[in-house]
């Protein structure tokens, strides 16, 4: 398997780079911007015309251990009267993030980076209508 | 760090939590999933709160390209295709983890970084502040 771009760079490797065994990389998991907070508008998940709920998934062998996933509440969108309009669609908006997975093999522990797709919220869209001939 | 249950038979390590620095396999699991939001769906055009995409590129980061959503309107698109300013387009934001080269320019040494990205926009009823 090819080594992914994460280990490639077009820069000259500086002398100060730490020695790393082949096929692996050194990862410091002390997070930069750890205390940054999301400043989203207040409770948009309830005020949206495509409202959603949140569920928290927890895995002690993943870092971070908690990942929050959104689920659209309706198939349609909420109209001005507060009723569901099924001529429109609530659809999930997704974003990739990285997590570190910890694997136990007997007493040895290995770490693997993993891409996880997170559903962040929902938006209301006009449906694509397929006409059958 | 976060506390991880350990096999009691394993030798003691320097830290009972997730260690501060780990050696990680270079092959990223699921790394070939689609990262370009334009190719994955056209929701950004079909939404009642449509958005544009801003390409944020940083070679010192993995992934080096992140797409940021910017809402096209302050209002939302109504059934007639016009902007309705009684509703608001707002960004949906998410904290994601990325890798930052540390020390800078090093090919195989990284630190996790938390960044805030706007992923898309959604149409909401505005919060109306009534003046007493």
């Amino acid at each position: 398997r090819k080594i992914p771009k994460v280990g490639h760079t077009f820069f000259q490797k500086p002398e100060s780079c730490p020695p790393v065994p082949g096929g692996s990389m050194k990862l410091d998991i002390g997070i930069i911007n750890e205390n940054q907070r999301v400043s989203m508008s207040r409770n948009i998940e309830s005020r949206s015309t495509s409202p959603w709920n949140y569920t928290v998934t927890w895995d002690p062998n993943r870092y971070p251990s908690e990942v929050v996933q959104a689920q659209c509440r309706n198939l349609g969108c909420i109209n001005a009267q507060g009723k569901e309009d099924i001529s429109m669609n609530s659809v999930p908006i997704q974003q990739e993030t990285l997590v570190v997975r910890r694997k136990h093999q007997g007493c040895s522990v290995s770490f693997q980076l993993e891409k996880v797709l997170v559903t962040v919220g929902c938006t209301c869209v006009t449906p694509v209508i397929h006409h059958v001939q | 760090g976060i506390t991880i249950p350990r096999n009691p038979g394993c030798p003691n390590s320097e830290d009972k939590n997730f260690p501060r620095t780990v050696m990680v396999n270079l092959n990223i699991h699921n790394r070939n999933t689609n990262t370009n939001p334009k190719r994955s769906s056209d929701y950004y055009n079909r939404s009642t709160s449509p958005w544009n995409l801003h390409r944020n590129e940083d070679p010192e980061r993995y992934p080096s390209v992140i797409w940021e959503a910017k809402c096209r309107h302050l209002g939302c698109i109504n059934a007639d295709g016009n902007v309705d300013y009684h509703m608001n387009s707002v960004p949906i934001q998410q904290e994601i983890l990325v890798l930052r080269r540390e020390p800078p320019h090093c090919p195989n040494s990284f630190r996790l970084e938390k960044i805030l990205v706007s992923v898309g926009c959604t149409c909401v009823t505005p919060i109306v502040h009534h003046v007493a």
Epitope: - | K38, Y44, N45, W51, N52, L53, H54, R55, W67, E68, K70, C71, R72, H73, L74, G75, V83, Y85, S89, V90, P91, S118
Partner: nanobody, 117 residues
Framework: EVQLVESGGGLVQPGGSLRLSCAAS????????IGWFRQAPGKEREGVSC????????YYANSVKGRFTISTDNGKNTVYLQMNSLKPEDTAVYYC??????????WGQGTQVTVSS
Amino acid sequence: EVQLVESGGGLVQPGGSLRLSCAASGFTLGYYAIGWFRQAPGKEREGVSCDSSSDGDTYYANSVKGRFTISTDNGKNTVYLQMNSLKPEDTAVYYCATCTDWNYDYWGQGTQVTVSS
């Protein structure tokens, strides 16, 4: 209340530079596709630049490409238009607004740019 206030215009000689500012209040500029527009006397209002687009690139009108640069300072809730190598045909009133909103309730008063020797 949503408000956009443009500043930084003035009289400049051909080949000179100006930096226009647009300060926003009532909403967070960085979350929206923000653009600069201009209107010359007797002409239609035209789009000059937009900080994002449907294809991910910053948009510039052909007449200003390579000379004008749009940027945003999220901390100051301000968008800028750096205008270099100005030409007499750049003379106009410059406005900022969300790139696709032609609702004039949300447009500022504009700032006059005059390029003349």
